[in-house]
C-alpha cells in the first residue's frame, strides 16, 4: 500500500533511453502518443513531473518490518495525463485521469546505476516499462538474467523541481 | 530488525592490505544499494564506495579510486571493502551503510557500528 | 563533483533555542539532499530525507527546507539530546557529504 496520498517530492525531467533517444509526447487526435526518437539538436525535449510516493514492499509483512520501502513514481507529460500500464496488451499508454490515480499509474523505482533508472509496474512486478520498436512498451524481465537489459533503461535530466506544470 | 555489522579493522602498515566485510541481516539484502562511508579521527563523513543490488556497477570517490574495490556476496548477506595501497590518510572509522529504499541509491538509511582501521608503520 | 558547504561549523546553543543549519551545494541537487545527525562514538543516523521528510521515529522539532543548492536543517526548540553533529548529504549527483555542524551546550 501507498503509505500517502502526497507524494514526498515532485521533479521536472526529460526522459530519454539508454541510448539517448528522447521520449515524447504528441497529441493527435484527442489523445495523445508517445514517440521514442531522436531530437533534432534545436529541439526541446519534453518535460515529464514525476512524483515520488513511499510504498511498503509488500514482503515487509513477512520479515522486512517497517524498513522494507520503495520508491514509486508517477510520470505526467502534461496536465491531467498520466502515463499508465495496459497489461493486456503489454503497452504503456497516456491517459487523462483523476486522483486518486489507479495502481497501472505507480512505477517502482528502480536506480539501475548511477544515472540509469527503470519502471517496474506496480501491478505486475517484474514487468517495466521499455523501448520496443520506438514505442515505449512492457517487457517481462528475468530478474536473474536481464537486470541491466539496455531496453529498459532510462536517463532522467532533471530540470528543476516544481509545483506543477 | 535491521542489522549491520563490519569486520576486519586494524593495524596495517603503509602499502599494505586490508579488507573489511559487512555481514547483513533482517533485510532484503539482494534488493538495496549498499554503500560505505569513512570518518578520520575528529573528521568529517566521506563516502568510500557504493555498489548496486547486483553488483553490477561500482563507484567510487577519486581519493580511493584504482585503489579500493567494493564487493557482495547476495548469497551470503555480505559487504566487502578491499583496500589495497593504504596511506595514513586512509585511517578512519569504516561504516558499512544500506540504501533506504528497495533499489534505490537515494538515502544512508541504516548504518553499522563501524570498524576502526589504522594505516601506520 | 559537487561540494557541498555547510555552515556554521560549530554553534553553541541552550536548551530551547530555535537552531538553524545551512548547506549550499556547488551546483543544483534539486531536493537530493538529506541531514543526519552522530552523536560522539556513534554511527550517524537518517533525521530527513529528500530536503523535508522526516525519518520514522525523528521527532517534529526538526524540519528541513530548500531546494537547488540551498537547504536549511532547523531544530525549533533544541533538547538535551540534540547536543549533536549534524550532516548534509548530496545523492544527486554522485554522493558528497557536507563538512558538518557540531552543536555544542552553551
Known amino acids: 500500500s501507498i503509505t500517502g496520498i502526497s507524494p514526498i517530492t515532485e521533479s521536472l525531467a526529460s526522459l530519454s533511453t539508454y541510448n539517448d533517444q528522447s521520449i515524447t509526447f504528441a497529441l493527435e487526435d484527442e489523445s495523445y502518443e508517445i514517440y521514442v526518437e531522436d531530437l533534432k539538436k534545436d529541439k526541446k525535449k519534453d518535460k515529464v513531473l514525476l512524483s515520488y510516493y513511499e510504498s511498503q514492499h509488500p514482503s515487509s509483512e513477512s520479515g522486512d518490518g517497517v524498513d522494507g520501502k520503495m520508491l514509486m513514481v508517477t510520470l505526467s507529460p502534461t496536465k491531467d495525463f498520466w502515463l499508465q500500464a495496459n497489461n493486456k496488451e503489454h503497452s504503456v499508454e497516456l491517459h487523462k485521469c483523476e486522483k486518486p490515480l489507479p495502481d497501472q499509474a505507480f512505477f517502482v523505482l528502480h536506480n539501475r546505476s548511477f544515472n540509469c533508472v527503470s519502471f517496474e509496474c506496480k501491478t505486475d512486478p517484474g514487468v517495466f516499462i521499455g523501448v520496443k520498436d520506438n514505442h515505449l512498451a512492457l517487457i517481462k524481465v528475468d530478474y536473474s538474467e536481464n537486470l541491466g537489459s539496455e531496453n529498459i533503461l532510462f536517463k532522467l535530466s532533471e530540470i528543476h523541481h516544481h509545483h506543477h506544470h | 530488525e535491521v542489522q549491520l555489522v563490519e569486520s576486519g579493522g586494524g593495524l596495517v602498515q603503509p602499502g599494505g592490505s586490508l579488507r573489511l566485510s559487512c555481514a547483513a541481516s533482517?533485510?532484503?539484502?539482494?534488493?538495496?544499494?549498499m554503500y560505505w562511508v569513512r570518518q578520520a579521527p575528529g573528521k568529517g563523513l566521506e563516502w568510500v564506495a557504493s555498489?548496486?543490488?547486483?553488483?553490477?556497477?561500482?563507484y567510487y570517490p577519486d581519493s580511493v579510486k584504482g585503489r579500493f574495490t567494493i564487493s557482495r556476496d547476495n548469497a551470503k548477506n555480505s559487504l566487502y571493502l578491499q583496500m589495497n595501497s593504504l596511506r595514513a590518510e586512509d585511517t578512519a572509522v569504516y561504516y558499512c551503510?544500506?540504501?533506504?529504499?528497495?533499489?534505490?541509491?537515494?538515502?544512508?538509511?541504516?548504518w553499522g557500528q563501524g570498524t576502526l582501521v589504522t594505516v601506520s608503520s | 563533483d559537487i561540494q557541498m558547504t555547510q555552515s556554521p561549523s560549530s554553534l553553541s546553543a541552550s536548551v530551547g533555542d530555535r537552531v538553524t543549519i545551512t548547506c549550499k551545494a556547488s551546483?543544483?541537487?534539486?531536493?537530493?539532499l538529506d541531514w543526519y545527525q552522530q552523536k560522539p562514538g556513534k554511527a550517524p543516523k537518517l533525521l530527513i530525507y529528500?530536503?523535508?521528510n522526516l525519518q520514522t521515529g525523528v521527532p517534529s522539532r526538526f524540519s528541513g527546507s530548500g531546494s537547488g543548492t540551498d537547504f536549511t536543517l532547523t531544530i525549533s526548540s533544541l533538547q538535551p539530546e540534540d547536543f549533536a553533529t549534524y550532516y548534509c548529504f548530496q545523492y544527486n549527483n554522485g554522493w558528497t557529504f557536507g563538512g558538518g555542524t557540531k552543536v555544542e551546550i552553551k
Open positions: 555498489i548496486t543490488p547486483n553488483a553490477g556497477e561500482d
Open positions: 551503510a544500506r540504501g533506504h529504499y528497495y533499489y534505490t541509491s537515494y538515502s544512508l538509511g541504516y
Open positions: 551546483q543544483n541537487i534539486n531536493k537530493h
Open positions: 529528500f530536503t523535508n
Open positions: 533482517g533485510f532484503t539484502f539482494s534488493s538495496y544499494w
